[in-house]
C-alpha cells in the first residue's frame, strides 16, 4: 500500500487552530507535476457533505512530502469529508477523513467501519441532543432509510446493512428531520473486495495474518498497518510518537500523537494513534489495552508488562506477542519484513537464527510462495547466532509474495514470513523529446513514460550518427534534468535512445525506441552593414546593404530586416529570401514614425550577427486640417468658402480638397480640388437653388491631411435646376474627384 497518512488535529476548542496534514513516505512524493511524482493534493470534498461556503482554506506545502490545510474560521467549516491524494500512476491513492461536529444532535459510535464482503455492517448513531422526530439515513448523499425516533435502542439509532458488497462503500449519515445537516452523524463504510482473510482478483489468495489491528488489502494482500506499527504483518511496534510504514514520521507537538486522528489508505480507514482512544483521541488506554484506539489487549504471560504503545514488554528469557515463547526455543533474528529484487536476478538471501540447542546449517530453510523449499548453500556460525545464506534461482514475477524462513531444532521451531517484491526494470515507452538544437549540440528531455517499476535511479542517453555502425556514445544523467549532447557534427541526423534503471542489481531496463534528431546547419558568421536608405513615400522605405568579402561560398539562405518602432513597442520583420539580394523595399510602414533598422544574414533557422542599427524618420502622413472654414451663399447656385491655412505645416501644400454633400442626401459626396494652395477662398458653382449643403476640406502635401470641421449653408431661392456643383470655371473643365 502507498505510505500516505492524513492527520487531523482534533483539539477543537478553537477551529482556527484546527489543521489537517497529509504526509507521504513515498520515494519522490510530491516532487512536482511531472511523470516522476505528482504532487500531494489535500482538499475538502463538498460533493456529499455540503457545508455553507466560507473563506477559502489555506494550503501550505512543507517540503516535498507534506501538505497542511488551515484557515478554518468556524466549527461548521470542519464538518464533512476531506481527502488527500498521493502516489504516482497505478499507485495513486486517496485517503479520506470524515469530521463530525462534537455538538451534533447525533454522533457516530465509530466513524470508520471496515468490513468484509458479505458481512453485516451495523452503523450506530448515538443521541447527543434528542429530537422527537424521524431520523433519516443517507448513503453517499442520497436518501437511504428512515427510523422513527421511537426506534432508538439504548439511546442509539442503528442501521443494519446485511450482506454488504463493495458498491455499498461510502459516506453514510444519520440526520434528524428538521435539523441542520451539520448536526448529522457521519460515517465511512469500507467494504473489502473479498471475504475475511482472502485477497486477490478471485479472492483465492490467503492474507498474511495481519497483527495489531492491521487490515489485509484486498488487491495486493499487504497489511495496512495501524499508526504506530510496522512490518509485513504489522508485527513490530514503532517507538512512541512515531508512525508511517517504516516509523519514519514523528507526531508534531510536545504531547506526541494525543488529539490526532490518523487516516490511512483503504481498507484501513481512520483511528487514533497507538496508545490513544476516544472521539477526540485524547484519552490514554486503560490498563491492559494498547494500540490504535486501544483496541488490543495485552494478556502478557511470564511476567511481561503491558505498554500502551507497543504491547507486551517481555522479561529476559521470554519473547513472543504475549511473552509466551521461551528463549530456548529457536528464534529467527532481525529478518527484514520486506525485500525487493529485480526481475531475472539471482540474489542471495540471509536468514539468521539463535536458540538452544544452537541452530546449524541444515536446520534453517527458505520457503518460496509456491511452496518450493531452498536449502542454504553456506552458513556462518557466530557465538550468538547462525546465519544461513541462500542462493535464489533466477527470479520470475510469480516469486513476488510471502516467503518464509523456518528454523527447527529439538528445542522447537520458529518461522518468519517476509515479503519479496520482484520488480520489473523500467523500459521507456516513448523516445526522448528534442527541446532545442544548434549546429553542434542537441538539448533533449529524457523524461518519458515507461513500463515496469520505478523509482528511476539513473537515465542513460545513447546516441550515434544515423546509419552509423560505430559504437554508441552514452551519457548518464539525472532523471529530472534536461540533457545537452555536445560536440556533434552540424546538419547531421543522430539516433537517440533512452535507457532507464531502477535501484538494485539488475535494475537496468531495455533500451527505449530510437528517435532521429538532426543538428542545425552552421551559424552564419558574416555581419552585414547598411549602405543607405531613402524614403519613397510616407509609408515606404528603400534599404540597401553590403556584406564583407570572404573566400568560399556564402553561408546563408537570405536576409532578415528588422524595424523597431520604439514608441509603440512593435517590431516589423521582413524576410528577403535570396542571399544575393542587397536591396529591399519596405512598404506599409506607419507615417511619421521613428524606426530603428538593422539587417542580418540567416541560414536555416539560425541568425547571424546584426548590422549596426540605423535610425530612420518617416514623414507624417499629411498636414493638419484647415482652420475656420466658413460658407456664405452668393446666389441661388453659388456658395463661397473661406478658411485659414493649417498651422505647423511639415512642407508646402500641393492642393486643397473640398467635399460637397447635400444635407440629408443619400448619395456619395463630391470632391473638388483647389489647385492654388496659396488661396484661402473659393466659390463653388452649379449648385441647386434653395438647397442645404454640407462642406468640409483638407490639405495635401505628400499625402492627404485631416478633415476640417463641417459647415452648412443653403443656396438662395428662385433658381433653375443646376447640372451640379463646380469650383470656379476651371473645375468644369477638369471634372470632379468623386
Amino acid at each position: 500500500a502507498v505510505d500516505l497518512t492524513l492527520l487531523a488535529n482534533l483539539r477543537l476548542t478553537d477551529p482556527q487552530r484546527f489543521f489537517l496534514t497529509c504526509v507521504s513516505g513515498e520515494a519522490g512524493a510530491g516532487r512536482g507535476s511531472d511523470a516522476w511524482g505528482p504532487p500531494l493534493l489535500l482538499e475538502k470534498d463538498d460533493r456529499i457533505v455540503r457545508t455553507p461556503p466560507g473563506p477559502p482554506l489555506r494550503l501550505a506545502r512543507n517540503g516535498s512530502h507534506q501538505v497542511t490545510l488551515r484557515g478554518f474560521s468556524k466549527p461548521s467549516d470542519l464538518v464533512g469529508v476531506f481527502s488527500c491524494v498521493g502516489g504516482a500512476g497505478a499507485r495513486r491513492t486517496r485517503v479520506i477523513y470524515v469530521h463530525n461536529s462534537p455538538g451534533a444532535h447525533l454522533l457516530p459510535d465509530k466513524v470508520t467501519h471496515t468490513v468484509n464482503k458479505g458481512d453485516t455492517a451495523v452503523l450506530s448513531a448515538r443521541v447527543h441532543k434528542e429530537k422527537q422526530t424521524d431520523v433519516i439515513w443517507k448513503s453517499n448523499g442520497s436518501y437511504f432509510y428512515t427510523l422513527d425516533w421511537h426506534e432508538a435502542q439504548d439511546g442509539r439509532f442503528l442501521l443494519q446493512l446485511p450482506n454488504v458488497q463493495p458498491p455499498s462503500s461510502g459516506i453514510y449519515s444519520a440526520t434528524y428531520l428538521e435539523a441542520s445537516p451539520l448536526g448529522s452523524a457521519f460515517f465511512r463504510l469500507i467494504v473489502r473486495g473479498c471475504g475475511a482473510g482472502r485477497w486477490g482478483p478471485g479472492c483465492t489468495k490467503e492474507c498474511p495474518g495481519c497483527l495489531h489491528g492491521g487490515v489485509c488489502h484486498d488487491h495486493d494482500g499487504e497489511c495496512v498497518c495501524p499508526p504506530g506499527f510496522t512490518g509485513t504483518r504489522c508485527e513490530q511496534a514503532c517507538r512512541e510518537g512515531r508512525f508511517g510504514q517504516s516509523c519514519q514520521e514523528q507526531c508534531p507537538g510536545i504531547s506526541g500523537c494525543r488529539g490526532l486522528t490518523f487516516c490511512l489508505p483503504d481498507p484501513y480507514g481512520c483511528s487514533c494513534g497507538s496508545g490513544w482512544r476516544g472521539s477526540q483521541c485524547q484519552e490514554a488506554c486503560a490498563p491492559g489495552h494498547f494500540g490504535a484506539d486501544c483496541r488490543l489487549q495485552c494478556q502478557c504471560q511470564n511476567g511481561g508488562t503491558c505498554d500502551r504503545f507497543s504491547g507486551c514488554v517481555c522479561p529476559s528469557g521470554w519473547h513472543g506477542v504475549h511473552c509466551e515463547k521461551s528463549d530456548r526455543i529457536p528464534q529467527i533474528l532481525n529478518m527484514a519484513s520486506e525485500l525487493e529484487f529485480n526481475l531475472e536476478t539471482m540474489p542471495r538471501i540471509n536468514c539468521a537464527a539463535a536458540g538452544n540447542p544452537f541452530p546449524v546449517r541444515g536446520s534453517i530453510e527458505l520457503r518460496k510462495p509456491d511452496g518450493t523449499v531452498l536449502l542454504s548453500t553456506k552458513a556462518i556460525v557466530e557465538p550468538e547466532k547462525t546465519t544461513a545464506e541462500f542462493e535464489v534461482p533466477r527470479l520470475v514475477l510469480a516469486d513476488s509474495g510471502f516467503w518464509e524462513c523456518r528454523v527447527s531444532t529439538s528445542g522447537g521451531q520458529d518461522s518468519r514470513r517476509f515479503k519479496v517484491n520482484v520488480k520489473v526494470p523500467p523500459v521507456p515507452l516513448a523516445a526522448p523529446r528534442l527541446l532545442t538544437k544548434q549546429s553542434r549540440q542537441l538539448v533533449v528531455s529524457p523524461l518519458v513514460s515507461f513500463s515496469g517499476d520505478g523509482p528511476i535511479s539513473t537515465v542513460r542517453l545513447h546516441y550515434r550518427p544515423q546509419d552509423s555502425t560505430m559504437d554508441w556514445s552514452t551519457i548518464v544523467v539525472d532523471p529530472s534534468e534536461n540533457v545537452t549532447l555536445m560536440n556533434l557534427r552540424p546538419k547531421t541526423g543522430y539516433s537517440v535512445r533512452v535507457q532507464l534503471s531502477r535501484p538494485g542489481e539488475g535494475g537496468e531496463g531495455a533500451w527505449g525506441p530510437p528517435t532521429l534528431m538532426t543538428t542545425d546547419c552552421p551559424e552564419p558568421l558574416l555581419q552585414p552593414w547598411l549602405e543607405g536608405w531613402h524614403v519613397e513615400g510616407t509609408d515606404r522605405l528603400r534599404v540597401s546593404w553590403s556584406l564583407p568579402l570572404v573566400p568560399g561560398p556564402l553561408v546563408g539562405d537570405g536576409f532578415l530586416l528588422r524595424l523597431w518602432d520604439g514608441t509603440r513597442g512593435q517590431e516589423r520583420r521582413e524576410n528577403v529570401s535570396s542571399p544575393q539580394a542587397r536591396t529591399a523595399l519596405l512598404t506599409g510602414l506607419t507615417p511619421g514614425t521613428h524606426y530603428q533598422l538593422d539587417v542580418q544574414l540567416y541560414h536555416c533557422t539560425l541568425l547571424g550577427p546584426a548590422s549596426p542599427p540605423a535610425h530612420v524618420l518617416l514623414p507624417p502622413s499629411g498636414p493638419p486640417a484647415p482652420r475656420h472654414l466658413h460658407a456664405q451663399a452668393l446666389s441661388d447656385s453659388e456658395i463661397q468658402l473661406t478658411w485659414k491655412h493649417p498651422e505647423a505645416l511639415p512642407g508646402p501644400i500641393s492642393k486643397y480638397v473640398v467635399e460637397v454633400q447635400v444635407a440629408g442626401g443619400a448619395g456619395d459626396p463630391l470632391w473638388i480640388d483647389v489647385d492654388r494652395p496659396e488661396e484661402t477662398s473659393t466659390i463653388i458653382r452649379g449648385l441647386n437653388a434653395s438647397t442645404r449643403y454640407l462642406f468640409r476640406m483638407r490639405a495635401s502635401i505628400q499625402g492627404l491631411g485631416d478633415w476640417s470641421n463641417t459647415v452648412e449653408e443653403s443656396t438662395l431661392g428662385n433658381g433653375l435646376q443646376a447640372e451640379g456643383p463646380v469650383q470656379e470655371s476651371r473645375a468644369a473643365e477638369e471634372g470632379l474627384d468623386q
Partner: antibody, heavy 127, light 107 residues
Amino acid sequence: EVQLLESGGGLVQPGGSLRLSCAASGFTFSGYVMFWVRQAPGKGLEWVSGIYPSGGWTVYADSVKGRFTISRDNSKNTLYLQMNSLRAEDTAVYYCARVNYYDSSGYGPIAPGLDYWGQGTLVTVSS
Amino acid sequence: DIQMTQSPGTLSLSPGERATLSCRASQSVSSSYLAWYQQKPGQAPRLLIYGASSRATGIPDRFSGSGSGTDFTLTISRLEPEDFAVYYCQQYGSSRTFGQGTNVEIK
C-alpha cells in the same frame, strides 16, 4: 419507473373487514416510509396510517386507531392495510403513497413529502 | 393534533391571473414539515411544494410557497388552464394532517 398499485377494495357491510394491498416497484421499497391516505367521495384528503421501513414502527390517525393495522412485506415489496370493524364513514378511495425526504436547500434541514401515489382503490361500507 | 385550515374554500379566477392560497395551522409547524399538493378530478394528488417553499421535481416556477410558524401561502403567479384543480396543504408533525382543500375554478 416508480409505481404503486392498490388492490383489495370493494363493497363491505358495516362491522365487516377488508384487507388492502399496495404493490410497489421501481424503487428500494424496504428503505421507505409508506402511508395510506383516503378521500371520502367529494371530500378532502385524510391521512390514515404510516409504517416505517423496518415495519417495527407504525402510526395511525385517531379515527382508525384500534380498528386498522398497517403492515408490510419487504421481501414482496408490498404494503397492507387490514381494516376491521368498518363503518359507513370509512367509505373512501384509499391511496398508498411513498414518503420521500428532500434537502430543501444544500445546507438546510431535510423536508418530507409524498412524492408518489397509487391510483387508489375504492372501499364502500354499506348495508 | 394539529388542525390545518385552508382559505378560501373556492377561488374563482381567470387564466393569467394570480392565485394566492392560504393555509393556517392550529399551532406552530416547522417550515420543513409543510407540503402542498394538487389534485385534479379522478386523479391521485401530486406533490407541488415541500419544506414550505421548495418546488418538487418537474413543477413549473409559476408555483411558489412561503410562510412560517402558523401561516403558509401557495402562490400561482399566472394561472394556466391546467392549474385549475383542488390544492391541499399537509403538515408532517405529530399527526400528518391535511387541510380541507381550496378549489381553484375558472371564473
